[in-house]
Interface confidence: low
């Protein structure tokens, strides 16, 4: 067990041309915070994959306000170290992701907004107990300077924090087979305590609590012999005639993998594939808990109150990802009403409204008809961002000032002739058709597809459209 420690020295513009503008302004003050994610080995994993060695979040830095247009200086940083405790051995090789986040403190709807300013990643070799290693990483126009180290927590020592030291019980030399625990003069290396019940003949361990099997033996405690010949029934009873060694229960029987891990057999033991948020030989260790604040952008962390349970981030609208670290296109939700144009400014959503509408989401319909008049008995109707007149029969145009030609649209079907009338239009239908617009055919036997013609009108008579 031990702690990985990260000290951020500076975050600011990198050398060379194209210095970035300050991420903060008088209008939009902000402050920085950092997140570190550690993974064992020299992996090239995606940023979203679990931080199997652990993760940590810094405190928020001091509030910073930059004058508009001024080049960005080194930004004020949070105090203190970022510490990532690790329970198992320090792997020696590790991958890191360090994210610089900006918390914007301007006047937003719904409180502060977070955005990722820069993300740097790297792969390093590092022995526990070594000095602070200094590093410079660049992300675009930004430069991050930091130091890091891994140190063991007593009683663990060594470059992997796997050796245990205990105070000497007497001022004499250390016990048989045990070395002095350099550099702690007054301590001795403690005997390695394997997993309880681990076979002393067929098992061994390289880390405390482990039980690794010698060849020919298997099972969680290395008490089960491995078959030396092929049996018809691999899990069947022993057969003296076939000379078959019974392997007994398989290493995955009973599923030794905790927290929903899936077990697969290996030539000498078993291997657990752990779900997100867990690692360790049996998926028994959680690298991140809700106490580490793994959910960004206002995400709600559920579960993970202790290191043996996973966490889930419930993301607020506009964010997704296992840690709510990815911003979704909030404009795809079409928040602007009445045809407004959506602008995602990062720190806030803005709607540019069409004429006649207002409000944060263009939800307010302005009074288009105020001071407007519609001529010739027309009535003003609000809507569509501009005033509109519903004109009386015989009139048209924006203000109902134009006399309408009701026949202009050729309303009479099937060759009917249109006649303008003071109250509208009249269609004189061609032989075989009837109806206000001559839309109905007359049946050959003289019956029509409509109920009987109104009294006083014979089929074929012109019908007025009232």
């Amino acid at each position: 067990a031990g702690v990985f420690e990260l000290q951020i020295h500076s975050f600011g513009p990198g050398p060379g041309p194209g210095a970035p503008r300050s991420p903060c302004s008088a209008r939009l003050p902000c402050r920085l915070f950092f997140r570190v994610c550690l993974k064992p080995g020299l992996s090239e994993e995606a940023a979203e994959s679990p931080c199997a060695l652990g993760a940590a979040l810094s405190a928020r830095g001091p509030v910073y306000t930059e004058q508009p247009g001024a080049p960005a200086p080194d930004l004020p940083l949070p105090d203190g170290l970022l510490q990532v405790p690790f329970r198992d051995a320090w792997p020696g090789t590790f991958s890191f992701i360090i994210e610089t986040w900006r918390e914007e403190l301007g006047d937003q709807i719904g409180g502060p907004a977070w955005s990722l300013l820069a993300r740097v990643a790297g792969r390093r070799r590092l022995a526990a107990g070594g000095p602070w290693a200094r590093d410079i990483q660049r992300a675009g126009a930004w430069e991050l300077r930091f130091s890091y180290r891994a140190r063991c927590e007593p009683p663990a020592v060594g470059t992997a924090c796997t050796r245990l030291c205990r105070p000497r019980s007497a001022p004499s030399r250390c016990g048989p087979g045990l070395r002095p625990c350099a550099p702690l003069e007054d301590e001795c290396e403690a005997p390695l305590v394997c997993r309880a019940g681990c076979s002393p003949e067929h098992g061994f361990c390289e880390q405390p609590g482990e039980c690794r099997c010698l060849e020919g033996w298997t099972g969680p405690l290395c008490t089960v012999p491995v078959s030396t010949s092929s049996c018809l029934s691999p899990r069947g009873p022993s057969s003296a005639t076939t000379g078959c060694l019974v392997p007994g229960p398989g290493p995955c029987d009973g599923n030794p993998c905790a927290n929903g891990g899936s077990c697969s057999e290996t030539p000498r033991s078993f291997e657990c594939t752990c779900p997100r948020g867990f690692y360790g030989l049996r998926c028994e260790v959680s690298g991140v808990t809700c106490a580490d604040g793994p959910c960004f952008n206002g995400g709600l962390c559920v579960g993970g109150a202790d290191p043996d349970s996973a966490y889930i981030c419930h993301c607020p609208p506009g964010f997704q990802g296992s840690n709510c670290e990815k911003r979704v296109d909030r404009c795809s939700l079409q928040p602007c009403r009445n045809g407004g144009l959506c602008l995602d400014l990062g720190h806030a959503l803005r709607c540019r409204c069409r004429a006649g509408f207002a409000g944060p989401r263009c939800e307010h319909d302005l009074d288009d008809c105020a001071g407007r008049a519609c001529a010739n008995g027309g009535t003003c109707v609000e809507g569509g961002g501009a005033h509109r007149c519903s004109c009386a029969l015989g009139f048209g145009g924006r203000d109902c000032r134009e006399r309408a030609d009701p026949c202009a649209a050729r309303p009479c079907a099937h060759g009917g002739r249109c006649y303008a009338h003071f109250s509208g239009l009249v269609c004189a239908c061609a032989p075989g058709y009837m109806g206000a617009r001559c839309e109905f055919p007359v049946h050959p036997d003289g019956a029509s597809a409509l109920p009987a013609a109104p009294p006083g009108l014979r089929p074929g008579d012109p019908q007025r459209y009232l």
Epitope: G12, A127, W132, P183
Partner: antibody, heavy 119, light 106 residues
Framework: QVQLQQWGAGLLKPSETLSLTCAVY????????WSWIRQPPGKGLEWIGE???????NYNPSLKSRVSISVDTSKNQFSLKLSSVTAADTAVYYC?????????????WGQGTLVTVSS | IQMTQSPSSLSASVGDRVAITCRAS??????LGWYQQKPGKAPKLLIY???SLQSGVPSRFSGSRSDTDFTLTISSLQPEDFATYYC?????????FGGGTKVEIK
């Protein structure tokens, strides 16, 4: 009370190897940087390099090709070797303890050893 | 990283307020210490992390920082304070000292 006691040859000829040792008495040997710093007569201080108990070290690039710092944790000692010395290496050499991550904290120093390089 | 210390020497009287500055060639955050050295002796730590007073050092010594400028102030100079003072940055390798300021009796 932590004490640093240093010793080594004080007079060398050009091209010889400077060798100094610093013993740490009292306090822990792990958890600190152990540094060598020198000061030519009448001049300022120059950092040479540092080591920790595990043997990891860092050196001043201006001297890196000639310098080696080693550690003997069983004796709580660390040593400096500087090869191919010239008159420019004439200086008082100090050993010092630096704390991890605390910001410029060389809190304990040896008494200093004057090393003169002369033909 | 170059540490430019000024003045290189100054003359003052007992009871005077004295200020010595070190300017870093680039940002070094608070990773700077101040040391006092008397002739024939090893340097002695006064201030670490730009403004933290080392245990056992009189409170008349103080340190401050403004961006890349660092100041050591002696509020009321005492006879035992006449010495040479050095700043040291440990923000980046190699660690570098300022050129020193010799405080002499006027």
């Amino acid at each position: 009370q932590v004490q640093l006691q240093q010793w080594g040859a004080g007079l060398l000829k050009p091209s010889e190897t400077l060798s100094l040792t610093c013993a740490v008495y009292g306090g822990s040997f792990s958890g600190y940087y152990w540094s060598w710093i020198r000061q030519p007569p009448g001049k300022g201080l120059e950092w040479i390099g540092e080591i920790i108990h595990s043997g990891s070290s860092n050196y001043n690039p201006s001297l890196k090709s000639r310098v080696s710092i080693s550690v003997d944790t069983s004796k709580n000692q660390f040593s400096l070797k500087l090869s191919s010395v010239t008159a420019a290496d004439t200086a008082v050499y100090y050993c010092s303890r630096g704390e991890y991550g605390s910001g410029s904290r060389f809190d304990y120093w040896g008494q200093g050893t004057l090393v003169t390089v002369s033909s | 990283i170059q540490m430019t210390q000024s003045p290189s020497s100054l003359s003052a009287s007992v009871g005077d307020r004295v200020a010595i500055t070190c300017r870093a060639s680039q940002g070094i955050r608070d990773d700077l210490g101040w040391y006092q050295q008397k002739p024939g002796k090893a340097p002695k730590l006064l201030i670490y992390a730009a403004s933290s007073l080392q245990s056992g050092v009189p409170s008349r010594f103080s340190g401050s920082r403004s961006d890349t400028d660092f100041t050591l102030t002696i509020s009321s100079l005492q006879p035992e304070d006449f010495a040479t003072y050095y700043c040291l940055q440990d923000y980046d390798y190699p660690l570098t000292f300022g050129g020193g300021t010799k405080v002499e009796i006027k």
